[in-house]
């Protein structure tokens, strides 16, 4: 049990969120971090993976309503599969209909997250800021 | 000890955040919630108080760097004191210099928070969305 060093008691009226990597945002037991150094999609993915996380996956407007208010454009973990025309997440799951409005503004196979659940298609090799996410169990 | 019902063990590599009201955002042990119903400043203040919180107080660009990415305009707990011309928070503390760029766009004694640590002066009776904050001990 050497990995554990704290025991905390949680009041019924409030709750703890996490666990998350230190100084990440915790919301509805998901962990998020916004990285403001610009990287291409592949580098962004690698950065998230190195922190035991993945690029942002949008799976619920309710559970992830904090994303409505996010300013600017950030890489998320959505990629286009040319062989079948679908958009899928890093974990292989297909983008659910009506979860994101996909904006066809650039020619590319990756997508940037923008406020109010929009996804902007972008060339995967263009540097952008990115959002990492870690789902707690 | 009847208020407490959970015992959790926290790994050294990760940490829990909070405690916060259920479904609030937790970041660097502060709790935040964005409310999208529009209220005037006084109603917004009352709403936060009813949830054992206060309107947003900006006290640190480092500890509150998540606020950089907030889209739109939201009431925060900053009010103008006409007698001495200062801006102060609900708790009576004075706004620290260089923490917010105050933008004099409207005539008023209250302030809206906008991304990248900007404060927009606004008439306190105008309805706006608002941010509540609860500092954990």
């Amino acid at each position: 049990n050497s990995l554990f060093n704290q025991e905390v008691q949680i009041p019924l009226t409030e709750s703890y969120c996490g666990p998350c990597p230190k100084n990440w945002i915790c919301y509805k037991n998901n962990c998020y971090q916004f990285f403001n150094e610009s990287k291409n999609w592949y580098e962004s993915q690698a950065s998230c993976m190195s922190q035991n996380a993945s690029l942002l996956k949008v799976y619920s407007k309710e559970d992830q309503d904090l994303l409505k208010l996010v300013k600017s454009y950030h890489w998320m973990g959505l990629v286009h599969i040319p062989t079948n025309g679908s958009w899928q997440w890093e974990d292989g799951s297909i983008l659910s209909p009506n979860l994101l409005t996909i904006i066809e503004m650039q020619k590319g196979d990756c997508a940037l997250y923008a406020s109010s659940f929009k996804g902007y298609i972008e060339n995967c090799s263009i540097p952008n800021t990115y959002i990492c996410m870690q789902r707690t169990v | 000890n009847s208020l407490f019902n959970q015992e959790v063990q926290i790994p050294l590599t990760e940490s829990y955040c909070g405690p916060c009201p259920k479904n609030w955002i937790c970041y660097k042990n502060n709790c935040y919630q964005f409310f999208n119903e529009s209220k005037n400043w006084y109603e917004s203040q009352a709403s936060c108080m009813s949830q054992n919180a206060s309107l947003l107080k900006v006290y640190s660009k480092e500890d509150q760097d998540l606020l950089k990415l907030v889209k739109s305009y939201h009431w925060m707990g900053l009010v103008h004191i006409p007698t001495n011309g200062s801006w102060q928070w609900e708790d009576g503390s004075i706004l620290s210099p260089n923490l917010l760029t105050i933008i004099e766009m409207q005539k008023g004694d209250c302030a809206l928070y906008a991304s990248s640590f900007k404060g927009y002066i606004e008439n306190c009776s105008i309805p706006n969305t608002y941010i509540c904050m609860q500092r954990t001990v």
């Epitope: 286009h80 040319p82 062989t83 079948n84 025309g85 679908s86 409005t101 066809e104 590319g108 298609i121 | -």
Partner: antibody, heavy 121, light 107 residues
């Protein structure tokens, strides 16, 4: 890059017709193909789309109601639109179109020349 | 389905005029809006995509603006070859829908 349309013509009410669109100059299997129609003197109306790849995923306008069917032949780089149970209201110019990039499905920069379908007894 | 309302349905203008066509969606479509030009007997031609991006090869006198529900196509100085029909199309979600069209005629 080109879309060449074939088919069309005069058909009796209740009849059927197949319109096809041959793609050249690009990898058909990685693009969506869309069909749009335009009744004489009227506006544009989206019919549906099909992906040229292995899955052949389709999407249709709600008014189509199963009367029209999209298909594709990857080897021939061809997309087809089968029209059935035709009525006079289906009289229109039918266009095939391709999006501006393979990951796009809703913005069309390449169009066929159009083929006229006339439904009349 | 998202409904697109275009106005006016027709307009008369002279060469050199500034022409504005509007398109309204019945729900927020962000900037997922395209504009097409169509000349008689021809297929439509993409002018503007993503509300304000000019398609390659389209003259700069064409511009698009707007976001959410209200959009505008502007021709800054009408040329003889611009007399045609113009259509907006929402590209936010299936089923795709077009506006009713605006016919630009010579005054």
């Amino acid at each position: 890059q080109q879309l060449e349309q074939s088919g069309g013509g005069l058909v009796k009410p209740g009849g059927s017709l197949e319109l096809c669109c041959i793609a050249s100059g690009f990898d058909f299997s990685t693009y969506w193909m869309t069909w749009v129609r335009q009744a004489p003197g009227k506006g544009l109306e989206w019919i549906g789309c099909i992906h040229g790849g292995g899955s052949g995923t389709t999407s249709y306008a709600s008014w189509v109601n199963g009367r029209f069917t999209l298909s594709r032949d990857i080897d021939q780089s061809t997309g087809c639109l089968q029209l059935t149970s035709l009525t006079a209201a289906d009289t229109a110019m039918y266009y095939c179109a391709r999006p501006g990039y393979r990951s796009w499905s809703k913005t069309f920069d390449l169009w066929g020349q159009g083929t006229m379908v006339t439904v009349s007894s | 389905d998202i409904q697109m309302t275009q106005s006016p349905s027709s307009l008369s203008a002279s060469v050199g005029d500034r022409v504005t066509i509007t398109c309204q969606a019945n729900q927020d479509i962000s900037n997922a809006l395209n504009w097409y030009q169509q000349k008689p007997g021809k297929a439509p031609k993409l002018l503007i995509y993503a509300a304000s991006s000019l398609q390659s090869g389209v003259p700069s006198r064409f511009s698009g603006s707007g976001s959410g529900t209200d959009f505008t196509l502007t021709i800054s100085s009408l040329q003889p070859e611009d007399f045609a029909a113009y259509y907006c199309q929402q590209a936010a979600s299936f089923p795709l829908t077009f506006g009713g069209g605006t016919k630009v005629e010579i005054k």
